[in-house]
Structure formats: structure tokens, C-alpha cells
């Protein structure tokens, strides 16, 4: 049967009808509506928006739309005691203070409740001391400082530029180096693209612009006070001293005008090489401390933010499936923003809104998807993926038994150059096939497919004629679904040209200047890129919910497993003496990957041939596909990261945003030459190879014939 017959609908109600219903003008209208005032998590404004979305999703035709609330730990600046950084002279007088707020953009001068720039979850404190410039504060930057340059950060305040890695990793690294405070700043080298004007005249970051953001190291825990369990009315909460992932030293972000004032006086060591220099007219000296004339001056931080248990609200909409109502395809993105959320998240939320409207239109005409579709507007993503994680913790038993797929829908754009997709290998073929059917919005590709423009602009480094698809990392709401629960996940958005624009993210990320006008004037005036992203996200959801056989290809997992096994083996072989001494063998992993490859191939052959009119066999084959991602979950989790349970992928221990393959083995090998007990360290490598090999073999066996 076709999917139309399976769901008792007229043939016109197919993917084309759904896609044709999506309109750029609606996305534009929704974006405007969502961005006129701030929607900070835990505020009345964001609660009101939740209720508005609930009401509109009901109007659009969903079967039910409910609010799911949780009481989680959030962080806010003290309204009467602002955060700032000073340069103080030998008498303790403040001779320079950083700004207390960003100059508001034109038209927003009278908007209230714009939260000033702050690092969410920073502890309170007023440390003072000498400054050390630590580049991006990456693991390798601290290795360079401590091992090569013999610079000790203990008792120092470090200043790090934003970019390259998640800010929480920067703070963790600074803490481990013994720093007593962290100043984060946006360097023009990373947040000011050459030849583009500053906002409001262009999409670049002005000198007074500042990136907000949380600095947690949650490792997938969700609410810091209720790890593993929902923060509901009867929750047992940890004391603040036992909370997960909180930083122990004060942290504060600044813009490049203020950074200039701090960095221009730096003395001490010169930067080790050009990769430590940004674009400010300062020497980028590492320190510690200020140069000659200013050597008696110190830096002092004044941080007075508070952590507060606060109510948050997710909106959960349901479109019940006609044939398999107990199989869930989830489309989710967050609603909370740091300020106006012009890009993050409302460019994504507007797309979700239009997707819901289109599905609702079809439903009102008598159509239903084969499987149930759940739509989610998550709260408190910016405070550590809290809304999505708490909901998943509350519903984990249902999700692990019924979850088919999760499609994430944060920012639809971070540029307007080409498509960017990160997903499980199970979705590669779905994404390829879908983008071949969609029109490219790109100039110079009129009449061509999205697949063609994407492949041309972002080619795969391994397979010619195919586009790049990246590994899932974290830093967004798919984390709990993929990394903890093992539900096949994916995300798509339009991105910049990474070749020519080497700045990190987009320049106005998490600043007050992320407005509706930023998008409408500079990124996507016709909203054609938003529409394309809506077609990709919506099309994926449609196919996942409506195709008779799930659109997952397990052979693509086999291909990447081989690649990842090769990569980790090559890393390990860089220590041949220890490999030989400790008899470290990858034989079990390569054998498991070989078995997986053969079994996946046979499964795919059976998938072509089986009787799709037999509902029991169909369900059995689909369940094998659905549960394959689940089979990569280790219930014990990764070492010291119990909520990262996927054995093939985890967020990098050095950058939450990046995905790492065979993370257990990778982390065991990382910097192994510096370990005090090599025998123990190589023993852990061997154990991680064993866990990985076992998991791959066990996953392979889930694809074998059942009896």
C-alpha cells in the first residue's frame, strides 16, 4: 500500500501538498511577532508567548496542545547591583569600568527588561589580580601556556576570546588551570567580517555588542539540581554545593571596545605565534599583568548574579497518527531567547510555527500522518537545554519505547550561503533524497535542486558528488534525545561560507542586536532561505511520520563505523611502543565493524523483499530500524559523563558543540603520554575498545533475522 492508502486519505494529501502549503510570508510574519520583546526563560513575557503558541497551535488544528512546566535552576543579574570589570590602581581606585549594558538598537530604546550581558550561572565574587591572555581558552591553548611558555595561571584572572569552542569548556579549562576569574570577549577577528558594516548598518558586531550565554558543564544532566529526573512538584533537589556543572569562579563577558582597554596594557610574554593574535590594535601579550608603566594596576571583577529556582514552560503539541499512534516523530525547537532572539531561536520557532500550520491545514482536510507527530516549543534552552531535558526525563520510558526520530529546530539561519545538516547516519539517505526534490533558493542555481547547490558549495570531504553531513555534537535540544536516549536525530539550517568567513558563529549571536530587522534587512529579505529550511525540516518530519517503511538506511551506519574505527586506530598507533608493550588490539573492533557491515547489507536486502502488506512483518522490520540507534546506547554511560550514553557519538570533552566518534576510546587516548600511570591509562584504552567492539557487535545483532 502507499502511505496515502495506509492513512485513508486522498492522494493529493502527500508530501507535495504539505510543502506547497508552507509560505515564506507566513514565516516572516511569525518571526516579527516573536521578536518584538525579549523572551528570557523564566520571565512573564516568555510564559505569555508559551500560551500564545499553545492557543495558535490549537487553532492550526493539532489534536492537543499542553504546557509542561518544571521548576529549574536559572541565573539572573542583580537588577540593583550590576556586574562589571574594573582596572584599579595601587590605591584601589577604579580608573576604568566596563559598560553596564549594550547601547540599544534603533527603535528599541524604550524596550524594558533587556537583560544586560552576563555569563549565566557565574558565582558571585570580586576577585582582583593580574590578567593573563589565554587566546580561545581551548585545551591546546592552556597546554601552550603551561607546558611550552611555563606561564602559571594560578591566582590570575584570565581573559579569553570567544569562538572555536563552547564557552563552558573555556571556563572549565580556566578553572583547571587555577584561574580565579574569567573575562570573555568578542574579538573582531572572530566576530567582524571584513567589508561589512556594524549593526544597524550591516550584520557585524559593534564594539559595544556582547555575547551572553551560559557557562555550565552539565554533560547532558539538565536541571543542575535534579540530574536524571524531572524537576517536578515533588522533586528532591540537590544543595547548590552538589549541583551539577556550576562554575566555581566568577565569569563575565565584554565587547571589543572594553576588551581593547584591558588588552592594550598587557605586558609579560609576547604571543607565541600569529594564531594568538586577533584584530584589535593591541600587542596580544600574554602577561601575566600589565606592562611597565601600568604594572601596579590590577583588574577587578564585580559579579553579583544570583541562581534561582524558576518555573519554565514547554509547549507540547500532538498530531495523532492514524496507523501507528504509538510511534513518535518529534519536531522541537526552543522559544526562550537572551534578548529579542531575531535569529536564535525565533528564526527556528517561526519555521516550526509554519510547519505546524501546514500539517494542521492537511489535518483539517481529513488527512492524518501514519505515525504520531509531536511538536515542541522548549523553554530554557539557553540555560543548559533545560526544558527539553526535563521533558525527556519525565517521558523517558515512553520515548525509549516509542521514539522514532527527533528533528531539531533552533535558528534556521546562521548565514545565507548553503545548507548545513548534522544528523545520524541513518538519515543520510533521507536527507539526500529529500534535497534532490527541493528547489535551491541560491542565486545562480535557479531551476536546480537544493542537493545540487548544497553539494557544489559544501562537498563531502570523502565522497565525490555528495554534500557534507556532519556529526551531531551538542549545544542544542537534540542532546537528550540522541546522546542520552538513542533516538535517531537530525538538524538542518542555512549557514555561511566557512571558507571565506572564518568568524565563529554569526557576529551578533546572543547580543541585543539580534533583531527582526537583522534578518529582514541583511540575512534573508525574501525569507527564501527560511522557507527552504522549513521544507527540509518539515519534509524530514513528513517522511519519517508517513513513509510505510522508515526512511533509515543502516548501511550508511556501517560506512561511518568503518571510517571511525580507522580514525581511532590511527590515533592509537601514534603510540606504537605502548601499543606493543600493553598488547593493545583493535582486532575486536574491526571484527565487529565487519560483522555490522555484513549484517546491515543482508538486512537491507530483506527490507527490499519483504511483504509490506503484512502489518506484523512491516512493524517488525520498522522496529529493527527504530531500535538500531537505541542499540548504540550503553546504560552505564561514558566515564564521568553518565548522561552521554551513545557509544559512537558524544559531544567532545573539549568542545560541547563538536561531535566526537568513539568518544570513550578517544578520551582514553587523549594526552595519554602525560598520564602518571601509563599501565592504568592503557588499560582504560583497552577497556574502551572492548566496550565499543561489544556495542557495535550487539547493535549488529539487532539487525539479524529475529529467529
Amino acid at each position: 500500500k502507499s502511505s496515502n492508502e495506509a492513512t485513508n486519505i486522498t492522494p493529493k494529501h502527500n508530501m507535495k501538498a504539505f510543502l506547497d502549503e508552507l509560505k515564506a510570508e507566513n514565516i516572516k510574519k511569525f518571526l516579527y511577532n516573536f521578536t518584538q520583546i525579549p523572551h528570557l526563560a523564566g520571565t512573564e513575557q516568555n510564559f505569555q508567548l508559551a500560551k500564545q503558541i499553545q492557543s495558535q497551535w490549537k487553532e492550526f488544528g493539532l489534536d492537543s496542545v499542553e504546557l509542561a512546566h518544571y521548576d529549574v535552576l536559572l541565573s539572573y543579574p542583580n537588577k540593583t547591583h550590576p556586574n562589571y570589570i574594573s582596572i584599579i590602581n595601587e590605591d584601589g581606585n577604579e580608573i576604568f569600568n566596563t559598560s553596564l549594558f549594550e547601547p540599544p538598537p534603533p527603535g528599541y530604546e524604550n524596550v524594558s527588561d533587556i537583560v544586560p550581558p552576563f555569563s549565566a550561572f557565574s558565582p558571585q565574587g570580586m576577585p582582583e589580580g593580574d590578567l593573563v591572555y589565554v587566546n580561545y581558552a581551548r585545551t591546546e591553548d592552556f597546554f601552550k601556556l603551561e607546558r611550552d611558555m611555563k606561564i602559571n595561571c594560578s591566582g590570575k584572572i584570565v581573559i579569553a576570546r570567544y569562538g572555536k569552542v563552547f564557552r563552558g569548556n573555556k571556563v572549565k579549562n580556566a578553572q583547571l588551570a587555577g584561574a580565579k576569574g574569567v573575562i570573555l570577549y568578542s574579538d573582531p577577528a572572530d566576530y567582524f567580517a571584513p567589508g561589512v558594516k556594524s549593526y544597524p548598518d550591516g550584520w557585524n558586531l559593534p564594539g559595544g555588542g556582547v555575547q551572553r550565554g551560559n557557562i555550565l558543564n552539565l554533560n547532558g544532566a539538565g536541571d543542575p539540581l535534579t540530574p536524571g529526573y524531572p524537576a517536578n512538584e515533588y522533586a528532591y533537589r540537590r544543595g547548590i554545593a552538589e549541583a551539577v556543572g556550576l562554575p566555581s569562579i566568577p565569569v563575565h563577558p565584554i565587547g571589543y571596545y572594553d576588551a581593547q582597554k584591558l588588552l592594550e596594557k598587557m605586558g609579560g610574554s609576547a604571543p607565541p605565534d600569529s594564531s594568538w593574535r586577533g584584530s584589535l590594535k593591541v600587542p596580544y601579550n600574554v602577561g601575566p599583568g600589565f606592562t611597565g608603566n601600568f604594572s601596579t594596576q590590577k583588574v577587578k571583577m564585580h559579579i553579583h548574579s544570583t541562581n534561582e529556582v524558576t518555573r519554565i514552560y514547554n509547549v507540547i503539541g500532538t498530531l495523532r497518527g492514524a496507523v501507528e499512534p504509538d510511534r513518535y516523530v518529534i519536531l522541537g525547537g526552543h522559544r526562550d531567547s537572551w534578548v529579542f532572539g531575531g535569529i536564535d531561536p525565533q528564526s527556528g520557532a517561526a519555521v516550526v510555527h509554519e510547519i505546524v500550520r501546514s500539517f494542521g491545514t492537511l489535518k483539517k482536510e481529513g488527512w492524518r500522518p501514519r505515525r504520531t507527530i509531536l511538536f515542541a516549543s522548549w523553554d530554557a534552552e539557553e540555560f543548559g537545554l533545560l526544558g527539553s531535558t526535563e521533558w525527556a526525563e519525565e517521558n523517558s520510558r515512553l520515548l525509549q519505547e516509542r521514539g522514532v526520530a527527533y528533528i531539531n529546530a533552533d535558528s534556521s539561519i546562521e548565514g545565507n550561503y548553503t545548507l548545513r545538516v548534522d544528523c545520524t547516519p541513518l538519515m543520510y539517505s533521507l536527507v539526500h533524497n529529500l534535497t534532490k526534490e527541493l528547489k535551491s533558493p541560491d542565486e545562480g542555481f535557479e531551476g536546480k535542486s537544493l542537493y545540487e547547490s548544497w553539494t557544489k558549495k559544501s562537498p563531502s570531504p570523502e565522497f565525490s558528488g555528495m554534500p557534507r553531513i556532519s556529526k551531531l555534537g551538542s549545544g542544542n535540544d537534540f542532546e537528550v534525545f540522541f546522546q542520552r536516549l538513542g533516538i535517531a536525530s537530525g538538524r538542518a539550517r542555512y549557514t555561511k561560507n566557512w571558507e571565506t568567513n572564518k568568524f565563529s558563529g554569526y557576529p551578533l549571536y546572543h547580543s541585543v542586536y539580534e533583531t527582526y530587522e537583522l534578518v529582514e534587512k541583511f540575512y534573508d529579505p525574501m525569507f527564501k532561505y527560511h522557507l527552504t529550511v522549513a521544507q527540509v525540516r518539515g519534509g524530514m518530519v513528513f517522511e519519517l511520520a508517513n513513509s510505510i517503511v522508515l526512511p533509515f538506511d543502516c548501511r550508511d551506519y556501517a560506512v561511518v563505523l568503518r571510517k571511525y574505527a580507522d580514525k581511532i586506530y590511527s590515533i592509537s598507533m601514534k603510540h606504537p611502543q605502548e601499543m606493543k608493550t600493553y598488547s593493545v588490539s583493535f582486532d575486536s573492533l574491526f571484527s565487529a565493524v565487519k560483522n555490522f557491515t555484513e549484517i546491515a547489507s543482508k538486512f537491507s536486502e530483506r527490507l527490499q523483499d519483504f511483504d509490506k502488506s503484512n502489518p506484523i512483518v512491516l512493524r517488525m522490520m520498522n522496529d529493527q530500524l527504530m531500535f538500531l540507534e537505541r542499540a548504540f546506547i550503553d546504560p552505564l554511560g561514558l566515564p564521568d559523563r553518565p548522561f552521554y550514553r551513545h557509544v559512537i557519538y558524544a559531544p567532545s570533552s573539549h568542545n560541547k558543540y563538536a561531535g566526537e566518534s568513539f568518544p570513550g576510546i578517544y578520551d582514553a587516548l587523549f594526552d595519554i603520554e602525560s598520564k602518571v600511570d601509563p599501565s592504568k591509562a592503557w588499560g582504560e584504552v583497552k577497556r574502551q575498545i572492548y566496550v565499543a567492539a561489544f556495542t557495535v557487535q550487539a547493535a549488529a545483532e539487532t539487525l539479524s533475522e529475529v529467529a
Epitope: R562, D566, M573
Partner: nanobody, 113 residues
Framework: EVQLLESGGGLVQPGGSLRLSCAAS????????LSWVRQAPGKGLEWVSS????????DYADNVKGRFTISRDNSKNTLYLQMNSLRVEDTAVYYC??????WGQGTLVTVSS
Amino acid sequence: EVQLLESGGGLVQPGGSLRLSCAASGFSFSSYALSWVRQAPGKGLEWVSSIGENDGTTDYADNVKGRFTISRDNSKNTLYLQMNSLRVEDTAVYYCVKDGVHWGQGTLVTVSS
């Protein structure tokens, strides 16, 4: 039983070239990544290069990058190392390695004028 047999070593002048081979048997050759490792006289083992299973990804130590090329012929169950622009410091016994624990007996490369 896994067997790895290296050949192709010898004496060569600086700037010269050699091609090492490693004939493999006793296992499914195309299912394994393979490596070359060397040991200079009086020194420890040093990784040189690795290649993925199916003619896949290659990786090189910094000091041989651009001079050495690893390759494999799965139909002949053979691994190769093409060494160009050889230097005196490349003098070593070169070993073929499968999965980290199976090593060949090595072939000696001497670079000397």
C-alpha cells in the same frame, strides 16, 4: 594464523627512493586498517603512517608527510609504503602492523651516502 611479511628494504643514498611491501595472510585483509611503524637504531618505536580499511583515509607522521605515501591493494592482500626524498634519519627497521598487536618481522632501510 595472522602473518605479515615485509620486503623492499635496503641501502639507499639520501634523496633516493624505496618501496616497501607487506604481504598479509590469515585474516580478512580488506576489513582492517593497517600501519607502518619504524625503529631507528637505539631508539624507540615510531609511528609512520596508517591507512583505512577500504583504500580509505591515510594519516602520516609530520616528519614523513609529503615524502612517504601509504597504499594498499586489497586484491593482493598487500600494504605498501612508497618512500621518496629519503634522509639519513629515516634509517630504521620498518614494521607492518595490523590492529596494534600483530607485527611483521620488519625490513631494514639504511639511508647513507
